[in-house]
């Protein structure tokens, strides 16, 4: 059913919940529909690497994932490292380089399965501020190319939170990141699961927002485990 | 609380046309875009396609490029999914999906698309 899997972020499960947290460690998130892929949010070449601390995978660049540097290491201190490229050994979609996923434990080539697939991105101008319709001509183009908002406003392009202005962050919309509002008390949120498959959500919503916690909504304890709502709720 | 409501679906031969439509109500806040899955029986939940009112753009799956369009109106709160060319391979529940600036949890109910050999 649809709500079985509203606190899962496992692909298999379907339909997810639409939006996840954006690296906000202990925040609310849940799952969004569809496709998982590996990605992130900044690019770095190995001249400059620094490690970059993290607590989830979409605050790494799109050849990164989030991780302990040390094997059986403290799960508490994350870098973000390189991704594994083809044929190497995984644990979840994100450590694998962009164009591969993980199975069965290895890093293989998505042209060889329907889950991401080559995505047609088609940028249309409008010729006005109204972008909610999309008339005019079309031209294929990179996810960067055009930015129409101004930066850290919602829906303005970003990296990462802190590109966006307060009470927003920065979150997944298709394959794309862009600011979106922090949830604020009573907004439905779900909690993280770190097990399973956590890729990145398509569309993505942000953490509660400070002095709230994702917890069960009182009038849902009875309901069954499935279908059990969270919330964002004072401490 | 907003309300995605999908029809269109049916059965149709291979080869053929179905045009899906889902209507959003209830809402109250913006919408930064709406998107199609669908589901095969025994398959995994798949995307189909997308369209960002924030962006401007539209997304496609490779296995449905250039066989389906995508369209909308976000004032009108309705988003279309013209699918021609359509083979077996696209039988499934169909689920409209949006990505509203409010909440997290917005899906239809999904509407049946059987395309007969």
């Known amino acids: 059913t649809l709500n079985s899997v509203l606190n899962s972020n496992a692909i298999k499960n379907l339909p997810p919940p639409l939006g996840g947290a954006a690296g906000h460690p202990g925040s609310a998130v849940s799952a969004a529909p569809g496709i998982l892929y590996p990605g992130g949010n900044k690019y770095q070449t190995i001249d400059n690497y620094q490690p970059y601390p993290c607590a989830e995978d979409e605050e790494c660049g799109t050849d990164e994932y989030c991780a302990s540097p040390t094997r059986g290491g403290d799960a508490g201190v994350q870098i973000c490292l390189a991704c594994r490229k083809r044929r190497k050994r995984c644990m979840r979609h994100a450590m694998c380089c962009p164009g591969n996923y993980c199975k069965n434990g290895i890093c293989v080539s998505s042209d060889q399965n329907h889950f991401r697939g080559e995505i047609e991105e088609t940028i249309t101008e409008s010729f006005g501020n109204d972008h909610s319709t999309l008339d005019g001509y079309s031209r294929r183009t990179t996810l960067s190319s055009k930015m129409y908002h101004t930066k850290g406003q919602e829906g303005s392009v970003c990296l990462r939170s802190s590109d966006c202005a307060s009470g927003l962050c920065c979150a997944r919309h298709f394959w794309s990141k862009i600011c979106k509002p922090v949830l604020k008390e009573g907004q439905v949120c779900t909690k993280h699961r770190r097990k399973g498959s956590h890729g990145l959500e398509i569309f993505q919503r942000c953490y509660c927002g400070e002095g709230l916690s994702c917890r069960i909504q009182k009038d849902h304890h009875q309901a069954s485990n499935s279908s059990r709502l969270h919330t964002c709720q004072r401490h | 609380e907003v309300q995605l409501v999908e029809s269109g679906g049916g059965l149709v031969q291979a080869g053929g046309s179905l045009r899906l439509s889902c209507a959003a109500s209830?809402?109250?806040?913006?919408?930064?875009?709406m998107g199609w899955f669908r589901q095969a029986p025994g398959k995994e939940h798949e995307f189909v396609a997308g369209?960002?009112?924030?962006?401007?753009?539209?997304y496609y799956a490779d296995s449905v490029k250039g066989r389906f369009t995508i369209s909308g109106d976000n004032a009108k709160n309705t988003v279309y999914l013209q699918m021609n060319s359509l083979k077996p391979e696209d039988t499934a529940v169909y689920y409209c999906?949006?990505?509203?600036?409010?909440?997290?949890?917005?899906w239809g109910q999904g509407t049946q698309v059987t395309v007969s050999s």
């Open positions: 999906a949006s990505d509203e600036s409010d909440a997290y949890n917005y």
């Open positions: 209830g809402r109250t806040f913006s919408s930064y875009g």
């Open positions: 369209i960002s009112w924030t962006l401007g753009r539209t």
